[in-house]
């Protein structure tokens, strides 16, 4: 999906008012310095592409993030503020439904959510120069 035509300010507002705290709660008990940010993004569409990938695509050692509360809210926000997103995701979801995973918090998942927090922070500050 091409995130170029999303309403970025509405997505930012959704993140600040309904998503950010759930990421913090997920990471509770973890030091903010524990993980290095290795995933970056250069602009808002790129950030949303990376956020979608990290949130919804199972990875080795962390298969279950898509069933977390913050993931559900991200899915809902993208569907509302990105034209055509819901249509493009329907087919993808049918395939995903067949392999729903039980929610398990692993160190790899914590690292992945830490990366997500960084991506969201970058999304919210689009005018900053890339480090």
């Amino acid at each position: 999906y091409d995130f170029t035509n999303c309403d970025f300010e509405k997505i930012k507002a959704a993140y600040l008012s309904t998503i950010s705290k759930d990421l913090i709660t997920y990471m509770s008990g973890t030091k903010s310095t524990e993980f290095n940010n290795t995933v970056s993004c250069s602009n808002r569409p790129h950030c949303l592409t990376e956020i979608q990938s990290l949130t919804f695509n199972p990875t080795a050692g962390c298969a279950s993030l898509a069933k977390e509360m913050f993931a559900m809210k991200t899915k809902a926000a993208l569907a509302i503020w990105c034209p055509g997103y819901s249509e493009t995701q329907i087919n993808a979801t049918q395939a995903m439904k067949k392999r729903r995973k039980r929610k398990v918090t692993t160190n790899k998942c914590l690292e992945q959510v830490s990366q997500l927090q960084g991506l969201w922070r970058r999304f919210n500050r689009p005018l900053l120069k890339q480090q």
Partner: antibody, heavy 117, light 109 residues
């Protein structure tokens, strides 16, 4: 303007079935997570069920296995199929638009379901 | 699912400040929402994301959330504020939304 209009409520005997409908207008229905919330007479609000744009569903424990939520995005309509109804299912049923999955920003006017012999 | 506990009733004199509490385990780690419901009407969202007001909701409505308690505050309460108020949050395991039992706000006089 944004509107949700429920229909299909009425009197039904215990063990019976009923299908509620909710017609949505004024917004892009196919993009939103939609839900049903009920309120027994003189009691509080109870979330019943919700459904994503892609058909992914969630249910309260009290109705799981008896109620089925569905939607027809081409008709901008939300449904709730209620089977094996019990007296404790008697309530006003509200159709609701759930903003960002975790709260309700738009409510219908409600439709009364009475389960009694 | 988590349980949200509200006082059944709160009374306040016109012009005074009304505070309605909502208790729940580690509630401060989740977002809380507040709804106003008047007799025979559907609920109306008055606070979202702990402390934000939807457009059209008067400034006298405010919210806070920390620790195990969220609070809805109505400053300079008016007669029209008499209603039932429900807090709402969500369960991080089931992903279901959860309502408090509701609080009947009575404006005296």
């Amino acid at each position: 303007q944004v509107q949700l209009v429920e229909s299909g409520g009425g009197l039904v005997q215990p063990g019976g079935s009923l299908r509620l409908s909710c017609a949505a207008s004024g917004f892009t229905f196919s993009s939103y997570y939609m839900s049903w919330v009920r309120q027994a007479p003189g009691k509080g609000l109870e979330w019943v069920s919700g459904i994503f744009f892609d058909g992914e569903t969630y249910y309260a424990g009290s109705v799981k296995g008896r109620f089925t939520i569905s939607r027809d995005n081409s008709k901008n309509t939300l449904y709730l199929q209620m089977n094996s109804l019990r007296a404790e299912d008697t309530a006003v049923y509200y159709c609701a638009r759930q903003q960002y999955f975790d709260h309700i920003d738009i409510w219908g006017q409600g439709t009364l379901v009475t389960v009694s012999s | 699912d988590i349980e949200l506990t509200q006082p059944p009733s709160v009374s306040v004199a016109p012009g005074q400040t009304a505070r309605i509490s909502c208790g729940g385990d580690s509630l401060g780690g989740k977002y809380v929402y507040w709804y106003q419901q008047k007799p025979g009407q559907a609920p109306v969202l008055v606070i979202y994301g702990d402390s934000k007001r939807p457009s059209g909701i008067p400034e006298r409505f405010s919210g806070s959330n920390s620790g195990n308690t969220a609070t809805l505050t109505i400053s300079g309460t008016q007669a029209e504020d008499e209603a039932d108020y429900y807090c709402q949050s969500y369960d991080l395991q089931s992903l279901n939304i959860v309502f408090g039992g509701g609080t009947k706000l009575t404006v005296l006089g």
